[in-house]
Each structure stands twice: as C-alpha cells, then as structure tokens.
C-alpha cells in the first residue's frame, strides 16, 4: 500500500489497533527518485483509561461560611487507579455566590483555576459563601468543572452548592438573618430593631410578588425576667405573646428594663411565616433566644490598644502577647474581658495551653497576659486576620482584629538573567528578571540593601545614587544601573534581600549589550577567504551615536581560521596580515578577510565556529559580542551570501570547472542561497529529518 506525504500531513492515515499491545509496521520511504531502506514504526497500544466521578456532587454551605469540598462531595477515580495528584479539575465556570480557593494559598488572591483530587481529599479546596446585601432563605450556586487525567478522555462535572439557613450551622447558631441581641442601660429602655433581630430571610422564601402580603410571626415562648417587651407601647404577656416582623421593621418593639441589677435578660421565641390575612402558609420556622445584656450606667467601655501583627514561620507555634491584644479598662479585671473569634483565617488557629489541641473561639485578656494563648500555624504561607469581638460583659462588644503574618523559613533571590545595559545608553532599569524574591511564593514586599557596590557604575533611584530599594521600585522600573566608568564591559554588585523577617544575599551581574549588527547568513565555505564588511559586522549605529570610530578587539577565535587584513590590490606587496584589532572604518573599506579553516582530524563535513570581539567607542562602556557562523566543505555550485575573496586551491585547479573560480580580490556572487522547500511539521517531515542524511 502506498501513502503520500500529504495524506499523512492531512491526518488521513489512521492506525487501527488489533491484537497485542506491542507491535507496529514496516515501511519504505521514496521521493520518486530515491528510496530509503526499510524502517520499522513501533506502535504501543495502551489500555483505554476511563475517568469516573462519584460523590454527591452537592455541597451544603451555611450562609457566609467556608466549607471544604470533601470526597463525599467530589470523588474522581480512573480505571487505571491513577494517583489522586494526577486527577486534575479545571474550573470552567466558577461560583456566582461566593468563591473557590485553596487553603494553602492567599484567599484574597485570584480565583482558583485548577485543583487535584488529592487536594480535595486533604480538605484544601474551600468554597466560601459571600453574604449578599439582600436577605435570602435558600440560594443555589453551581460550579462547572472539567476532570482530566491524560490519556483518559475529559469528564465534565457540575457541583451544585446549596446555601441555606435551614441547615444546622455551628458557626451561625441563628436561622434568622440577624439575631444579635441587645444592650440596654440599667433601668432604661431600648428599641429592638431589625439591626438586632430580623427574620426577613424567612419572608425571602416567598416569591417577591407575594412577599408584601406575608409576614413573620414571632411568638414569645419565654418572657424576659428582668424587664418587659412592648409593641406599640402595649406590653406583651402570656395572653398576648405575639409580634410581627412588620412591627419590628416599623420600630414598634421595645424592651424596658425594670432596674435592680445588671444581670443578663432575654426572651425565647418561635418565628414562622404567616400568610395573607393571617392564613396558614407553608414555610420555614425557627425557635431561638434573643439575648439582652443590661449594662451598668456608670460602666466605662474598654478601649482597645494598637495591635502589632504576630509574626511566625510556617508550621510553628507562637504565643500571643499584649503587643497583639490588649485593652485599657479601669473597671474590669483581665479575666472579665472576653474575646470571641468571629472569623478565623485559614493559616492556623488559636489554642489555649491546657485547653486541648483544638482551636479556641473564646478566651480572656487574662489568657493573653499569662501567655496561655498561642497561635498555631498550619502549612499555609499566607497572612491572615482574626476578626474578634471584645467585651467586658458590661458594654456592647467592640470589633478587634489580630493580624498574623506567616514568615518564610527561607527566601531565595531569583536571578533569571544578568542585567544587560545597551552600549550606547550606558544605563538600564532592573526588573524581576534580575531580582525577585521567592519563599514558597513570590514576595512582592521584599526590600534590598547594597552590601557590595558595583565597581564601574552606580545604582540610581529617581536619578540619585542609592544603596537601598524595594521590589516595588524594581517592578516599577525605578531602579537603574548606570555605568560611570567606560573601561569595563561588565560589572557586578551584591545585595541583601529582606522579606518578612528573613534575608538572603545575591550577586547581580551586569553586562554591556553591544550596539552591533551581526549577520552570519548561511554556511560559509571551508578553505575560502571571505570578506568581513558591514554586511557581516556593522557598528555604524554606535559610530553615529558616539560620534566616533568604533574599534574592535579580537578576544577569541576563530578555532579554525583567522582574521586577516587583505592587500588593497593584487599589486600590493605582501600577503595577508593577521589582525587582532580593527575599526569600523576597516570594515567599511573592505580591508578585512576571514580565512575559514577546515576542522582537522575528522571527516569533511559541516562545522560551527565563532569570533568573540570586544567593541569600543568613545564615552561608552566596551561590550563583548560574538559572531557565530556555520561552515561546510566548499560547494562551487552553491551561491554564498558573503563576498568570497578566495576559494580553496583544490576547487581552483579542478578541471572543467572554470566558473567555480573567483579571482582573488574580486567579490564573489552575492545572491542568497534559496531555502529548500520542506514540508513543515507532520509525520513525513519527522521521517525526512531523521532518516535521510
């Protein structure tokens, strides 16, 4: 059977597997004129791997909370028993009512795009519901995922998220939109408003067109013991225990304290949806308590003090001191000042010495003062903030926050490339290519201090020499290296980088990038002398910029051959002189030649060679540049892209080929060699490249 290259490239030739897993086919290759010897194309068949998705694919989340995805929710497996690390989920469409993030990465950062089944098993993939401004009873979100693990076929998955006040939520004991309790001065009265008690989320379970006809009925099941509830100035009592959400919203509910002490008070209630005109309606209900705190009228509220962030390394433990949490309260003992965690970060938890291993959500100032309270960092490297509420039990709670910075155990200064300074400019801005600090993540807040300055230049910020700068200034392109001494083509300086309390040093290398145009063109003929002129090396732009004649110094090479000065005419005495230095003018005058040698000690064939040059010009630093070129045995039939001053002796004396000889001192043909037409890519070109020499 014959197949053409175009059929192969068009994807029309298919291999159909049958039988054993290992095998293949033999073939010969022909271009119509030549035929290659037989080849064997090996084919290894793999058993088809199938991905499957188990788990409920539903996640129930408490309003405003964070819920990890678990194996009960999302469990992928493959018929090949693939490692869970290699089962990759891609988030095709993220959540609308919240966000998906990784516990070990910055939760404030960009949305999560990929995660693995292993990360799901580890409980590291978290869905956070963001509370909307409008009340709701139940909301539904979806995540569209694509499961992949080559070579298996991708599988699409939808994860349904139900956010509901119906669910029992440890982090949110109330099923109502708000149940915050009330603070009332002793012997006084205070209005209970929807800022403190609000069941409008129950109403939200009714479609909006009918909502205005519904209400929420509160039935007081246990009355306050130290005061009285009034609705529109009418007292509530066992015989009249009801009030409505609409009355609450209208500000008609009041608690009047009876005086005689500051003990806690409150009431218990049942709340349910009430239909039009008081008719029954199916809907949510809840039984809860509303806390009323009576405060001493002479009470002075505690004053929170400024807080210093806690800093510790990943996976370690650090005590929390008064530097992080303290208050001034003249009428409360430290044991009376209570803190409650409202929201914890994902980088660790608070624990009390002697209080078990688990996280604590309540502690006192006495715990802080005695050093019993500690923060335990998990593997995460991100900063986090504890949102706390603090109260002395006699004043309304005050919000406080405790910032936790996770310090890296080590940092590394990444130097991706030396700083290249354009020769004519003599200065260049540093970028992340030169200086970037990473720990287990990028450190954008890094600061740098010069501990060994450059020899031939300065570091500048805002045009002024500096010995200290920041990563931000680097990223903004504000940190500049400028040569002040034009005697070296390179320089270096050493910096000390500091990021989140950890330091590391690094050396930044500076090189000058030659303002030189280099064109080597196609391969050059071995044994020939070719002319070095501005078509090959050109520092004309540098000459214009510096108003000088650039000078070249040969530092190295060529390995096979030499640079020579050629006589101006055949009558000029003497042969070619060896050259170690030359000028742009020499190039323009056509006075330079490159004798291309043959590699010794091996069979004739293509080879590579190079020249390393140092380029000087007035008022700018020198620069090192190289001219890399390929060589091949001389081919008289081939047009070369450079002027040949002489060709190999053997070629000149070869009979019957006078046209292959080019008189010395006269330019040879300048036509470019045409590129052979070769099919780009595909199976055929793979074979051509690998099987014919």
């Amino acid at each position: 059977r014959t197949r053409s290259g175009s059929q192969l490239d068009g994807g029309l030739v298919l291999f159909s597997h049958r039988g054993t897993l290992d095998g293949g086919f033999r073939f010969r290759l022909s271009d119509g004129e030549h035929t290659s010897p037989g080849h064997f194309f090996r084919v290894t068949a793999q058993k088809q791997v199938l991905l499957s998705l188990k788990g409920s694919q539903t996640l129930t989340v408490c309003p405003g909370s964070v819920q990890p995805l678990s194996s009960q929710t999302l469990r992928a497996s493959s018929s090949a028993g693939t490692d869970p690390q290699l089962l990759l989920y891609r988030v095709v469409r993220g959540p609308q009512l919240g966000r998906l993030f990784h516990a070990q990465q910055d939760s404030t950062g960009e949305a999560l795009v990929n995660f693995t089944q292993a990360e799901v098993y580890a409980g590291n993939i978290l869905y956070e519901h963001e509370m909307p401004p409008e009340p709701f009873w139940e909301a539904h979100d979806t995540l569209e995922l694509q499961l992949s693990s080559p070579p298996a076929r991708d599988v699409a998955a939808t994860l349904a998220v139900a956010v509901s006040f119906e669910a029992a939520c440890p982090q949110r004991p109330s099923h109502l939109w708000k149940n915050k309790g009330l603070w009332v001065p002793e012997g006084q009265r205070a209005r209970i408003t929807v800022a403190a008690l609000d069941a409008s989320n129950l109403l939200a379970s009714v479609p909006s067109p009918q909502r205005s006809e519904h209400d929420v009925l509160f039935q007081v099941t246990q009355f306050p013991s130290r005061g009285q509830l009034l609705v529109s100035e009418e007292p509530l009592h066992a015989g009249q225990p009801h009030f409505l959400q609409s009355q609450l919203a209208a500000g008609q509910l009041v608690y009047a304290h009876g005086g005689g002490g500051t003990q806690q008070d409150g009431f218990h209630f049942r709340a349910h949806l009430q239909g039009p005109a008081g008719a029954s309606v199916a809907g949510p209900q809840t039984s809860e308590a509303f806390a009323i705190t009576v405060r001493d009228v002479n009470e002075r509220p505690p004053q929170p003090q400024a807080s210093v962030p806690l800093r510790l390394t990943r996976g370690s433990r650090a005590p929390i001191s008064r530097a992080q949490l303290s208050v001034v309260d003249p009428d409360s003992a430290p044991g009376e000042i209570e803190y409650e965690v409202q929201r914890a970060p994902h980088n660790g938890f608070l624990s009390l010495v002697g209080g078990g291993l688990g996280p604590v959500t309540r502690f006192t100032q006495a715990d802080v003062d005695s050093g019993r309270l500690a923060f335990v960092a998990n593997g995460s490297s991100v900063a986090g903030i504890f949102q706390l509420s603090m109260s002395d039990g006699a004043s309304p709670p005050l919000p406080m926050s405790l910032a936790v910075d996770i310090l890296p155990s080590a940092i590394e200064v990444q130097l991706r490339a030396p700083l290249e300074v354009p020769q004519a400019l003599g200065r260049s801005s540093l970028s992340q290519q030169q200086l970037r600090v990473v720990s287990d993540r990028e450190e954008p807040e890094a600061a740098y201090r010069l501990i060994q300055g450059p020899q031939y230049g300065h570091l500048l910020v805002g045009g002024r020499p500096t010995s200290a700068f920041s990563q931000f200034q680097i990223d903004q392109g504000e940190v500049v290296f400028a040569f002040t001494n034009s005697s070296s083509s390179h320089d270096h300086f050493r910096v000390l980088a500091l990021a989140r309390g950890v330091n590391a040093s690094a050396v930044v290398n500076v090189t000058v990038r030659a303002l030189l145009h280099v064109w080597a063109g196609g391969p050059w003929p071995q044994g020939a002398t070719l002319r070095l002129d501005p078509t090959v090396l050109d520092a004309g732009e540098l000459a214009n910029r510096t108003d000088s004649v650039p000078r070249f110094r040969l530092l190295e090479g060529p390995r096979h051959g030499r640079v020579v000065r050629v006589p101006r005419a055949r009558t000029e005495p003497g042969g070619s002189q060896l050259v170690e230095q030359f000028t742009q003018q020499d190039l323009e005058d056509g006075r330079l030649g490159l004798e291309v040698g043959r590699p010794e000690g091996r069979a004739p064939g293509p080879a590579g060679d190079s020249l390393t040059l140092e380029l000087w010009a007035q008022g700018v630093p020198p620069a090192v540049a190289s001219l890399d070129f390929a060589t091949e045995p001389y081919n008289a039939a081939r047009p070369y892209s450079v002027a040949l001053l002489s060709v190999p002796e053997a070629a000149r004396t070869e009979a019957g080929k006078p046209e292959s000889s080019t008189p010395t001192g006269e330019p040879g043909p300048m036509a470019s060699s045409p590129e052979p037409a070769v099919a780009k890519g595909g199976f055929l070109s793979f074979l051509e490249a690998n099987m014919f020499s």
Epitope: S212, E213, D215, L217, S232, H242, L244, S246, Q247, A250, Q252, R270, H272, L273, Q274, P276, A277, G278, A279, S280, V281, A282, G283, P284, Q285
Partner: antibody, heavy 117, light 113 residues
Framework: QVQLQESGPGLVKPSETLSLTCVVS?????????WSWVRQPPGKGLEWLGT???????YYNPSLKSRVTISVDTSKNQFSLRLSSVTAADTAVYYC??????????WGQGTLVTVSS | DIVMTQSPDSLAVSLGERATINCKSS????????????LNWYQQKPGQPPKLLIY???TRESGVPDRFSGSGSGTDFTLTISSLQAEDVAVYYC?????????FGPGTKVDIK
C-alpha cells in the same frame, strides 16, 4: 386597647350599593394588623366578607368577590366596605373586626343594614 | 372552600355540668410551618358581637376563664366548658383561619337545663 365602630345607612334599596365605614380608635390602623368585615343575617351564622391590610392588599370571599370592595384611609384611621347590587339576602348585621395573627381578635358592635325598597 | 360543621346544633346543660361542642373541618387545618391548628372558637351572646375564646385550637385568649378549653387536631375539634355558668349561655362558633375564604361553623346554642 383598640376599639372599632361601624357607621353607615341602616336601610339600602335593592340593586343599590351598601357603604359602611369602620373607625379605629385606641391604635393606629397602620400597625401590623389586618382589618376585616364579617356579617350575620338575622338568626343565622357568621360570614366573612373580606380583609384589608393598611397598605391596601385585599382578600375577598369568592362568593361575593365581584360585588365587594374594601378600602383603607390611613389618614382618617378608618376602613370601608362597599357591597354593590344588594338584594334582600344581604340584610344582616355587619361587623368590622381586627384580624390579629390568625383570628378575629376584636370586633365592633355591629350595624344592622336592611335591604328593602 | 373549607366547610365547617358543628354538632350538636344546640344543647342544654345543668349549671356546673360539662358542656362539649364538636367542630369538624372538611380538610385539615394543621399548618406544616408551625404545627398549629388554625381553628378558633368564638362566643356570641344575644345582641353582642362575637368574642374570641380560643385560638390555634387550644390556646385560651387572655382574660378567658379557664373553664373553657379547646382540643383536637387536623379536622376534629372540641370546645369544652368544664363547669357551665349562667353567663356562658350563648351561641358558640368555630372558625378556620387556615385558608381564604375564612369560614365559620353554623354555631351551637348552649342553654341551661
């Protein structure tokens, strides 16, 4: 404690429209209550006619729906009943009542309306 | 519509004796949202408006003597006057507030024997 008082003509001719007003005292009509009309033909049982909320939402007895209209005037703290195309069968004592939660918590004294030519 | 029926139409009980009135609804008036029966009992004395006695089938309205009690669930309900007093002579109505239209039973007349 809220008091309700019905007022309106005691005699209405057949095919005309019966109009009654209920004045609420001792409380605001805008408080979260529904306000209702119930009637009782002489020697017979009670029949609910309809209910209105202070915002104007109304519910009517379907058996009378095409003829009954209840409206509220919060500025005067009163609500009204209109029953069109009356016949002798509409002769009754008409009560206004405060609907609280899911019951008729307090009632007016009632007014007898006779439909006769 | 939910149809309410009462039995008996009338009854005469000696002073101090128990009076029992039954009420039946054509469908359940038990609410799933709060587990309450939307069934109320009213007392109407001659020449007076009705007065609320019992709401949610068994909760006595404030100021109502404790000789009045209500029981039952779903569709069958009972009003009991444990020891009839002279001032209890009246017509007693049951009423469902479960769904519109709200409907009353035909009434039960209680007299002293």
């Amino acid at each position: 404690q809220v008091q309700l008082q019905e007022s309106g003509p005691g005699l209405v001719k057949p095919s005309e429209t019966l109009s009654l007003t209920c004045v609420v005292s001792g409380g605001s009509i805008s408080s979260s209550n529904w306000w209702s009309w119930v009637r009782q033909p002489p020697g017979k049982g009670l029949e609910w006619l309809g209910t209105i909320y202070y915002n104007g939402n109304t519910y009517y007895n379907p058996s009378l729906k095409s003829r009954v209209t209840i409206s509220v005037d919060t500025s005067k703290n009163q609500f009204s009943l209109r029953l069109s195309s009356v016949t002798a069968a509409d002769t009754a004592v008409y009560y206004c009542a405060k609907s609280w939660v899911s019951w008729f918590a307090s009632w007016g004294q009632g007014t007898l309306v006779t439909v006769s030519s | 519509d939910i149809v309410m029926t009462q039995s008996p139409d009338s009854l005469a009980v000696s002073l101090g004796e128990r009076a029992t009135i039954n009420c039946k609804s054509s469908q359940s008036v038990l609410s799933s949202s709060n587990n309450k029966n939307y069934l109320n009992w009213y007392q109407q004395k001659p020449g007076q408006p009705p007065k609320l006695l019992i709401y949610w089938a068994s909760t006595r309205e404030s100021g109502v003597p404790d000789r009045f009690s209500g029981s039952g669930s779903g569709t069958d309900f009972t009003l009991t006057i444990s020891s009839l007093q002279a001032e209890d002579v009246a017509v007693y109505y049951c009423q469902q507030h479960y769904s519109v239209p709200f409907t009353f039973g035909p009434g039960t007349k209680v007299d002293i024997k």
